[in-house]
């Protein structure tokens, strides 16, 4: 079934309560415009944003019978001429009579007659109508023939994009059959279709078709009020393409529209081939979009590549939400033109600062006021990380101008980075020389402490991304941050007693759930000694508060639990609810305190892994005193496992390479950084080691494990061949520095640095790290492998 037929069927369903063959139509209030009711329009009770009233009429082809409900009788079938009377197109019938067309359409043959309604004739320009009436034998006859096709075509045969030769000089009739059920012929809407006749079919249309002989190019060349657009089309080498065959829709801005543009904007765009071509193409659709087919907002791709939203408000057409079409449906032989009174500027023709919307005006105003706008050169490439207006507090705005400028510089990058270019672990450099980290989560992208909101755009000289908060690059390490805040003095002392201070000082990516002194309320000095006395217990407890990877609270999908594996090995459960982070269902007191090697979320309770039993009565008593949110298991004699600290030290490896090995890049897989289950995935690939191809079987174990590779630092490299030490060093640092694979050569383990060294020298691996231990160096996180 065609779209028209589907909508008609829907109208029939909506009208069946009124009796057989009754269709529900919706009439736009204050107009005579009626539409068969689509599902969407029915429920909205509106078309083009205007309220509608429901009318119940006989479905096409049926009629009422006196004293009976609905439309139980079928309309009589007659020849085309008689059918014009049946459908009420009496003016067309009269003109067919006086123009001597009557004999033709009463006789033999098969015709499709697109018959203008009586109202359509009334709306026709009076001079044109008079001209037809003054020359009925030629002009009127030709005009009517141009509404006819030499075969019967029902709406199901009227396919979108079809061009049917009319009976006048084979002039084309452009058929459009839209998904909303609207069928148009040269942009005239079929308001009553498929009235079958003995020798054809009649479709009533809402306007008289005027003869089409010109292309869009011809129209532009003839229309003085489009001279600006014409000149711009010539400049962009687009005018001739608008003379070619096609089904284009052109939104042509008038000269007045160009006058509305700030002169500077126009001068810049017209001086930039790429921008001016983008500007022109943004006004052209590769599909024919008649105004009558627009019954609600719809998005269309332009020739430029970006989309525009075409909507309607009553009789007016809006583009991107603004009423701007002042003349509709100028039909040409290769498309339709709508005259608009504003120039549409695509993002691709805008300067990066012009991409900002109403919600980022504080940022753009400050950028201009503090002299940063002038540093955004039109031929440069930048990225603006624009916080929304309410991110700027009064305190921030009243800051010293120099400080404010430094803050703003943290929001401008030296390069153009589009949304699709961002990846987890990426480091971005600002124009102020600061480095910002990118964190990619399941439903969020964050830079440092601030996460993006929708609305990223790419312009001519850069991109813009919108952020919830002002971005604050971290200055201090986790350890320094804890040390400068008195709230964490107890936790810090325990951390140091457990020999874990270095862990929070060295580079890395961690999430620390830092308990405040309140978490230890009531702990006596004896109890503290008890805790410190069992180093394994202390390490297990502290490392349960530390998770590899940076997890920003605002990056969490709201209301969804995220299961992370802590450094201690047990799981921790995080959830974002109403701007608050829940850690094991405990409310975080403060979150997203950024540091150079991670993020801190503040908790006022001590956290404990529910799966780890305690075997010491005194320790259990202490933990029960401090931890109320879970019931800690007691298993007499149970001890805490040792967590080998060597695992968390970054390794320094010396590699001496003799000779000139043949290095070839083999693309490594992603690091697994998510809690995953399932069968191992085994892949075979060949790696070139010391010039020799070696077949390696890779087993990606899908257990609950987080795997990351140690980072190797090369301190001395000597070569005995053509390659310079420097190039080879660069190559090694780039390509071999992160080993993030399970390689089967026993039971699926990570190589240690020594093994890598031996591999590079051609030996086979010997020493292995047990599979239940984690290797931790400064980490590379995978993009997909995040649980957020």
């Amino acid at each position: 079934n065609s779209y028209y037929d589907k909508v008609l069927a829907h109208s029939r369903i909506r009208g069946r309560d009124q009796g057989p063959n009754v269709c529900a139509l919706q009439q736009i209030l204050g107009t005579k415009k009626k539409y068969f009711s689509s599902c969407k329009n029915w429920y909205q009770g509106a078309i083009c944003g205007k309220k509608t009233t429901v009318l119940y009429e006989c479905c096409p082809g049926y009629m009422r019978m006196e004293g009976m409900k609905g439309c139980p009788a079928v309309m009589p079938i007659d020849h085309v001429y008689g059918t014009l009377g049946i459908v009420g197109a009496t003016t067309t019938q009269h003109y067919s009579d006086v123009s001597k067309l009557r004999e033709e359409i009463e006789g033999k043959g098969s015709y499709t007659y697109f018959a203008p309604s009586n109202e359509a004739w009334e709306n026709l320009d009076s001079d044109i109508r008079r001209g037809l009436e003054n020359n009925v034998n030629v002009e009127l006859l030709n005009a009517l023939h141009s509404h006819m096709v030499n075969k019967r075509m029902l709406t199901k045969d009227l396919k979108h994009g079809m061009v049917i030769p009319s009976m006048y000089n084979n002039l084309g009739l452009f058929i459009n059959h839209y998904p909303n059920g609207v069928v148009t012929v040269n942009c005239a809407r079929v308001i009553h279709g498929n009235q079958i006749a003995t020798n054809g079919v009649v479709h009533v249309i809402d306007r008289v078709l005027t003869q089409i002989g010109t292309s869009i190019q011809d129209f532009l060349e003839a229309e003085d009020d489009l001279s600006s657009f014409r000149a711009a089309a010539i400049t962009s080498d687009l005018l001739e393409s608008l003379g070619r065959d096609g089904h284009f829709t052109l939104f042509a801005p008038t000269n007045e529209a160009f006058e509305k543009l700030p002169r500077g904007v126009l001068e810049r765009i017209m001086g930039d081939k790429v921008a001016s071509e983008a500007l022109m193409k943004y006004h052209i659709l590769n599909t024919l979009q008649c105004s009558e087919a627009i019954t609600g907002g719809a998005v269309f791709e332009t020739m430029e590549g970006n989309t525009i939203e075409i909507g309607c408000e009553g009789d007016s057409i809006s583009i991107n939400g603004i009423k701007m079409v002042n003349k509709k449906d100028i039909v040409t032989k290769n498309g339709v033109i709508h005259l608009i009174d504003e120039v549409l500027i695509p993002d691709s023709a805008k300067q990066v600062i012009e991409l900002a919307g109403k919600q980022q005006t504080t940022f753009t105003d400050l950028v201009a006021q503090l002299g940063l706008a002038s540093s955004l050169k039109p031929d440069g490439e930048y990225t603006l990380l624009a916080p929304v207006n309410n991110a700027f507090s009064d305190d921030t705005l009243s800051m010293d101008q120099r400080l404010l400028k430094l803050i703003l510089q943290n929001h401008i990058l030296k390069v153009k980075v589009g949304l699709s270019d961002l990846y987890n672990g990426q480091i971005l450099e600002t124009i102020g020389g600061k480095q910002l980290r990118v964190f990619v989560y399941r439903t969020a992208i964050c830079i440092e402490n601030s996460c993006m909101v929708r609305g990223s755009k790419q312009g001519r000289n850069g991109a813009i991304h919108i952020f919830r908060e002002i971005i604050q690059p971290a200055e201090k390490s986790l350890h320094d941050k804890l040390r400068q805040d008195k709230r964490f003095s107890i936790f810090l002392s325990l951390l140091e007693a457990a020999d874990l201070k270095d862990l929070l000082t060295q580079p890395g990516d961690w999430t620390l759930f830092a308990p405040t002194n309140d978490a230890f309320k009531g702990m006596t000095s004896e109890e503290r000694e008890l805790l410190i006395g069992d180093k394994n217990a202390l390490q297990n407890i502290i490392l349960y508060h530390l998770t590899p990877g940076v997890y920003i609270g605002k990056g969490f999908e709201p209301g969804v639990t995220n299961i992370l594996k802590t450094t201690q090995g047990s799981k921790i459960y995080l959830k974002g609810v109403n701007e608050t982070l829940l850690v094991n269902e405990l409310k975080s007191k403060e979150s997203d305190i950024m540091t150079t090697n991670g993020v801190i979320h503040v908790v006022d309770k001590l956290l404990y892994p529910a799966d780890i039993p305690v075997g010491n009565d005194q320790l259990l008593e202490l933990l029960n005193k401090l931890i109320k949110y879970i019931q800690i298991k007691f298993v007499r004699g149970s001890t805490f496992k040792e967590i080998p600290m060597t695992v968390y030290r970054p390794a320094m490896t010396k590699i001496q390479i003799e000779g000139d090995p043949d290095f070839r890049l083999i693309k490594e897989g992603e690091t697994v950084t998510e809690v995953i289950h399932g069968e191992p995935v085994i892949k075979k690939y060949t790696k070139i080691i010391d010039g020799v191809p070696v077949e390696i079987t890779e087993k990606q174990t899908r257990e609950e494990r987080i795997i990351t590779g140690p980072e190797i630092k090369y301190t001395r490299i000597s070569t005995g061949g053509g390659e310079t030490g420097e190039t080879l060093q660069k190559f090694l640092q780039k390509e071999v520095s992160k080993v993030t694979k399970f390689i089967e050569g026993g039971d699926g383990h990570l190589f240690e640095d020594e093994e890598i060294k031996r591999l590079l020298q051609g030996d086979t691996p010997a020493k292995k790290i047990p599979a239940n231990k984690r290797v931790q160096g400064p980490r590379r996180r995978s993009r997909e492998g995040r649980s957020q």
Partner: antibody, heavy 118, light 110 residues
Framework: QVQLVQSGAEVKKPGASVKVSCKAS????????ISWVRQAPGQGLEWMGW????????NYAQKLQGRVTMTTDTSTSTAYMELRSLRSDDTAVYYC???????????WGQGTLVTVSS | QSVLTQSSSASGTPGQTVTVSCSGS????????VNWYQQLPGTAPKLLIY???QRPSGVPDRFSGSKSGTSASLAISGLQSADEADYYC???????????FGSGTKVTVL
């Protein structure tokens, strides 16, 4: 064909005002703007401002803001430029030019010499 | 004083190519398009090149324009005696919000 015909030469005293007219023909007057450009004797060109013949919107050069007024009369397809508080350095040939914006100053009037002398 | 800098004169013999240069800043030529005007002795200026390199209809293809960074140039090939005139470059200046002209270059055909 497109033509812009300007009013004749004027001699004015310092402090006075001058109003130069520019009658357009050969095109739809309201479809284009008009810019005014002046040229002091033996000197280069200086843009004074622009007016939309359709809306009457104007854009004046900062230097002349407050002293210059540009107007149009669509019924006669004529543009006017009035300069007040004349000084001797306002002595110049004043040109009107059709300004389509996309194609700037594509047709020029013949020029009107305004001499400011005491 | 003009915002755009042009060499005061240039000359060539018939048939030669003469290049007129125009130098500006990031706020004018650097950001916007350049247009060129020809002013024959005792006449009004005439648009020669617009949008850096576009010729209006009726302008011979001996005239060509180009722009790079903050400077632009006009090349006149196959120089003719009728080309003897003053040539002005012009561009919009974002910082002044004004249309600015160059000082003009007098081209002489030897």
């Amino acid at each position: 064909q497109v033509q812009l015909v300007q009013s004749g030469a004027e001699v004015k005293k310092p402090g006075a005002s001058v109003k130069v007219s520019c009658k357009a023909s050969g095109y739809t007057f309201t479809s284009y703007g008009i810019s005014w450009v002046r040229q002091a004797p033996g000197q280069g060109l200086e843009w004074m401002g622009w007016i939309s013949a359709y809306t009457g919107n104007t854009n004046y050069a900062q230097k002349l803001q407050g002293r210059v007024t540009m107007t149009t009369d669509t019924s006669t397809s004529t543009a006017y430029m009035e300069l007040r508080s004349l000084r001797s350095d306002d002595t110049a040939v004043y040109y009107c030019a059709r300004d389509m914006l996309v194609v700037p100053f594509d047709y020029w009037g013949q020029g009107t010499l305004v001499t400011v002398s005491s | 004083q003009s915002v755009l800098t042009q060499s005061s004169s240039a000359s060539g013999t018939p048939g030669q190519t003469v290049t007129v240069s125009c130098s500006g800043s990031s706020s004018d030529i650097g950001s916007n398009r350049v247009n060129w005007y020809q002013q024959l002795p005792g006449t009004a200026p005439k648009l020669l090149i617009y949008s850096n390199d576009q010729r209006p209809s009726g302008v011979p293809d001996r005239f060509s324009g180009s722009k790079s960074g903050t400077s632009a140039s006009l090349a006149i090939s196959g120089l003719q005696s009728a080309d003897e005139a003053d040539y002005y470059c012009a561009a919009w200046d974002d910082s002044l919000s004004t249309y600015v002209f160059g000082s003009g270059t007098k081209v002489t055909v030897l």
